[in-house]
């Protein structure tokens, strides 16, 4: 399916374009430069380069990107004409990825080139909207390049509750070439993928040598006043590769792990998904580590280790505790297929 025609950009009339390494011939545009006259050439760029030619042609060998600029030809110290030269590298083939961070926002399609594109490089997103009611409609979206993020990004408008498929392709072009990405298809609702939960904190609970308290927040890009998130939590001892996964109730932003290994550092991560299973799970949050509470043994004057008061709570008969009701989680033993 071809979404649009991806062509090299047109250049201003009279502009000479070239690939790096080529030999370029510039022709002074004034009629008066024809014949056996002595023409003086000056490059208008940063380096002060000058040439004198008999006749109206200037030959530049092995041109490079830095040779881009205006070449001024003059006769008797008067400007006769300007020849713009644009040396550019054809764009690389873009690899497009599209996402939608919550059900209220537009989809964003982006591409991060492996090397900084030339200033003349432009990108446009060709899109086809496939709607069960209205059929198909084609449109184009201009894309912006961010110097900070080093990526092109384009917004595809999606209204809240829209149930439509989009097929998109990114066209990247400059004066010497153009490339299109492979077509990317997505469904407006199924593509919703939250950012990972934020500010994950893992802490020990005094008196509980096998418990870890975990808390987190919704990502900045998710507004919980409209759509709630459900979460999965996974944890493992640092030396293990296998995770235990807990599926948590909707809108629960903390949890207590009851079966951590005593005295062992654990890796914990959380991910989120829209409460009604709309879209996809977020990526797992960055790993955070925590170690359960460790009893501090006391030394008697005789040097005997003795700690009669610090019997761990789970070894005592009393299991009623403020943390006891904090999880009603479904436990799934890993390895987890993602």
């Amino acid at each position: 399916l071809v979404l649009g025609s991806c062509r090299a950009l047109e250049v201003a009339n009279g502009t000479v374009t070239s690939l790096p390494g080529a030999t370029v011939t510039l022709i002074c545009p004034g009629k008066e430069a024809a014949g056996n006259v002595t023409i003086h050439w000056v490059y208008s760029g940063s380096q002060n380069r000058e040439w004198t030619t008999t006749g109206n042609t200037l030959v530049l060998r092995d041109v490079q990107l830095s040779d881009t600029g205006d070449y001024l030809c003059s006769l008797n110290d008067h400007l006769v004409g300007t020849v713009p030269l644009l040396v550019d590298v054809p764009p690389e083939e873009p690899k497009l990825s599209c996402f939608r961070k919550n059900p209220l926002v537009n989809a964003i399609c982006e591409w991060r080139p492996s090397s900084t594109p030339s200033p003349t490089t432009k990108a446009v997103l060709f899109a086809k909207k496939i709607n069960t009611t209205n059929g198909k409609s084609d449109f184009q979206v201009p894309c912006q390049y961010s110097q900070q993020l080093k990526s092109f990004s384009c917004q595809v408008e999606i209204l809240e509750g829209d149930k439509v498929y989009h097929i998109v392709s990114l066209c990247v072009a400059n004066s010497v070439g153009s490339k299109s990405s492979h077509n990317e298809a997505f469904h407006s609702l199924k593509m919703v993928q939250p950012d990972p939960p934020a500010n994950l904190v893992v802490s020990a609970i005094p008196g509980r040598p096998r418990w870890l308290k975990v808390s987190w927040q919704h990502p900045e890009t998710w507004d919980p006043s409209y759509y709630l998130l459900q979460f999965q939590l996974r944890y493992r001892p640092v030396w293990s590769k296998e995770f235990t996964v807990l599926l948590l109730p909707v809108a629960q932003y903390q949890c207590v792990i009851h079966d951590a290994l005593r005295g062992v550092k654990h890796v914990v991560q959380v991910r989120g998904k829209e409460e009604l299973d709309l879209g996809q799970w977020s990526e797992w949050s960055p790993e955070v580590t925590g170690t359960p509470w460790i009893a501090e043994p006391r030394t008697t004057p005789a040097g005997i280790l003795w700690n009669p008061t610090q019997v761990s709570v789970e070894d005592s008969a009393n299991h009623e505790d403020q943390y006891e009701s904090s999880t009603e989680a479904t436990s799934v033993l890993a390895p987890v297929q993602e």
Epitope: E32, G35, S44, D70, L75, N76, D77, H78, L79
Partner: antibody
Framework: QSLEESGGDLVKPGASLTLACTAS?????????MCWVRQAPGKGLEWIGC???????TYYASWAKGRFTISETSSTAATLQMTSLTAADTATYFC??????????WGPGTLVTVSS | DIVMTQTPSSVSAAVGDTVTINCQAS??????LTWYQQKPGQRPKLLIY???TLASGVPSRFKGSGSGTDFTLTISDLECADAATYYC?????????FGGGTEVVVK
């Protein structure tokens, strides 16, 4: 080497007039820019146009196109033809050969007065 | 057409002073700028071409600078003989353009 303008006169509005620029000590055939510039009494310099001698290449200020015509009449003479003259065209008309580093030559000017 | 804007339109200075005249082009003219001096009843005299190159026989008290759109003519050690009107000119045969002129009065 020198240039001299001639043909300046007192004419009535709507009239036409041709000014001549004659070169001494050099000929136009070697490819020069011959330009015409005018200066109204007490005002600044105003470019009219240029001809590249030995070719049919002419350039004009946008306001001069259509009413002013520059021609090369011989290897030592160029002319400026002016039509539909108005009082605003009253000025001293200079012809100039400007070669930058190779020398700059202006005639003394010729006065054109348009008055009824 | 390119427009050349000269400032100030008139300047008065004493003998020995330094005078600066500015010329601004409405678009990039690189270094293709000429400065002329004209005294009443006389033809213009070339002072500086290519923005900064002194014409033959012109004293070094005259100095041109600038490129692109902004140019300056500086006359140092002002003399009585410098009393005149000074013009900047864009030097492209396809379109000359003169500034409005700056009258220099020597007190």
């Amino acid at each position: 080497q020198s240039l001299e303008e001639s043909g300046g006169d007192l004419v009535k509005p709507g009239a036409s007039l041709t000014l001549a620029c004659t070169a001494s000590g050099f000929s136009f055939s070697s490819g020069y820019y011959m330009c015409w510039v005018r200066q109204a009494p007490g005002k600044g310099l105003e470019w009219i146009g240029c001809i590249y001698t030995g070719s049919d290449t002419t350039y004009y200020a946008s306001w001069a196109k259509g009413r002013f015509t520059i021609s090369e009449t011989s290897s030592t003479a160029a002319t400026l033809q002016m039509t539909s003259l108005t009082a605003a065209d009253t000025a001293t008309y200079f012809c100039a050969r400007d070669l930058g580093s190779r020398g700059n030559l202006w005639g003394p000017g010729t006065l054109v007065t348009v008055s009824s | 057409d390119i427009v050349m804007t000269q400032t100030p339109s008139s300047v008065s200075a004493a003998v020995g002073d330094t005078v600066t005249i500015n010329c601004q082009a409405s678009e990039n003219i690189y270094s293709f700028l000429t400065w002329y001096q004209q005294k009443p009843g006389q033809r213009p005299k070339l002072l500086i071409y290519r923005a900064s190159t002194l014409a033959s026989g012109v004293p070094s008290r005259f100095k041109g600078s600038g490129s692109g759109t902004d140019f300056t003519l500086t006359i140092s050690d002002l003399e009585c003989a410098d009393a005149a009107t000074y013009y900047c000119q864009r030097n492209a045969y396809s379109s000359w353009a003169f500034g409005g002129g700056t009258e220099v009065v020597v007190k």
